[in-house]
Amino acid sequence: LLVSQGVLLKCQKGSCSNATQYEDTGDLKVNNGTRRNISNKDLCASRSADQTVLCQSEWLKYQGKCYWFSNEMKSWSDSYVYCLERKSHLLIIHDQLEMAFIQKNLRQLNYVWIGLNFTSLKMTWTWVDGSPIDSKIFFIKGPAKENSCAAIKESKIFSETCSSVFKWICQY
């Protein structure tokens, strides 16, 4: 069982009651996927200076972030949702050092989905957090057109059809 006895606090003098307070948080839908709204409090809590980031079992830690490498294969959108369900996102690569870390931990030479797709709305390659790709750092081989999603292979980024099935990487 996942449960043992509860922690019961009893007060022997007088009775106590507390009003329950609930906070509601909304979601924001973007490009068929659901991007989560993050409250100010969440943003402040995300990386408190005095808290060391420790990743869960099965996740690898690098530069204060956690990475999960899939073993199965899915389309880009299914991979996107898979990460979202784990309150993470498809991999966003910030620099070549991060790319080197990723490549070191990829044990195969096949394509792997990352959190980058071509949005017809902006007519540009966009990371899943909404930021544009830095063309000074990364070059994407292949067509930049609707229904194009990015996959990495041997430290290079390729444009692939979003419905193709590859492994993927989640990050939080």
Epitope: D24, T25, R36, Q56, L84
Partner: antibody, heavy 116, light 110 residues
Framework: SLEESGGDLVQPEGSLTLTCTAS????????MCWVRQAPGKGLEWIGC????????TYYASWAKGRFTITKTSSTTVTLQMTSLTAADTATYFC?????????????WGPGTLVTV | DVVMTQTPASVEAAVGGTVTIKCQAS??????LSWYQQKPGQPPKLLIY???TLESGVPSRFKGSGSGTEFTLTISDLECADAATYYC????????????FGGGTEVVVK
């Protein structure tokens, strides 16, 4: 807010379906979860459904096969329970995991009692 | 499945005192741990999430700490209003997802 309904007295080996109804928000991409509490005992997680397009479900290992969570509308989720035994006697709560980066059940229903 | 274990089984403290509740996960859950307060006849109420972040409206007397497999809830300056049952809940978010609860300590506030 959330409210559970359908709790009842049921015979051993019987089945029962509980409903969780939301008001004040629609299910978009939340986890809607079921938790139970036997009389005088602790909280026990049963399972959750992701109410986004995937509709993925996750269950405690002991609940797989006998318990099924389904999203039946934009404001209702059900818990189907089969082959019930006396050990399933409990108050059943539904809870919503907040739709943000962090894991937390920030809205709970008052619970509904199931007696086997 | 990840198993959460809360300790000790029982503790007694005076009003104004401090209570420390420990929660151990059977494998690393990072900082994905919440603490709840439950009073008889009521549903649980969220106190702390992400191991140390106070939910809105919760007094700062409640403090969460820890990461990985070891977590602690400390309630200082105990008040009568703190009479309740406290639970930790971990979230495991890898190939499978689970939300196990722990249990733990009966605390009597004198």
């Amino acid at each position: 807010s959330l409210e559970e309904s359908g709790g009842d007295l049921v015979q051993p080996e019987g089945s029962l379906t509980l409903t969780c109804t939301a008001s004040g928000f629609f299910f978009s991409s939340y986890y809607m979860c079921w938790v139970r509490q036997a009389p005088g005992k602790g909280l026990e997680w049963i399972g959750c459904i992701y109410t986004g397009s995937s509709g993925s479900t996750y269950y405690a290992s002991w609940a797989k096969g006998r318990f099924t969570i389904t999203k039946t509308s934009s404001t209702t989720v059900t818990l189907q329970m089969t082959s019930l035994t006396a050990a399933d006697t409990a108050t059943y709560f539904c809870a919503r995991d907040a739709g943000t980066t962090y894991w937390r059940y920030n809205i709970w229903g008052p619970g509904t009692l199931v007696t086997v | 499945d990840v198993v959460m274990t809360q300790t000790p089984a029982s503790v007694e403290a005076a009003v104004g005192g401090t209570v420390t509740i420990k929660c151990q996960a059977s494998q690393s859950i990072g900082s994905d741990l919440s603490w709840y307060q439950q009073k008889p006849g009521q549903p649980p109420k969220l106190l702390i999430y992400t191991a140390y972040t106070l939910e809105s409206g919760v007094p700062s007397r409640f403090k969460g700490s820890g990461s990985g497999t070891e977590f602690t809830l400390t309630i200082s300056d105990l008040e009568c209003a703190d009479a309740a049952t406290y639970y930790c809940q971990g979230t495991y978010r890898s190939s499978s997802i689970s939300w196990p609860f722990g249990g733990g300590t009966e605390v009597v506030v004198k």
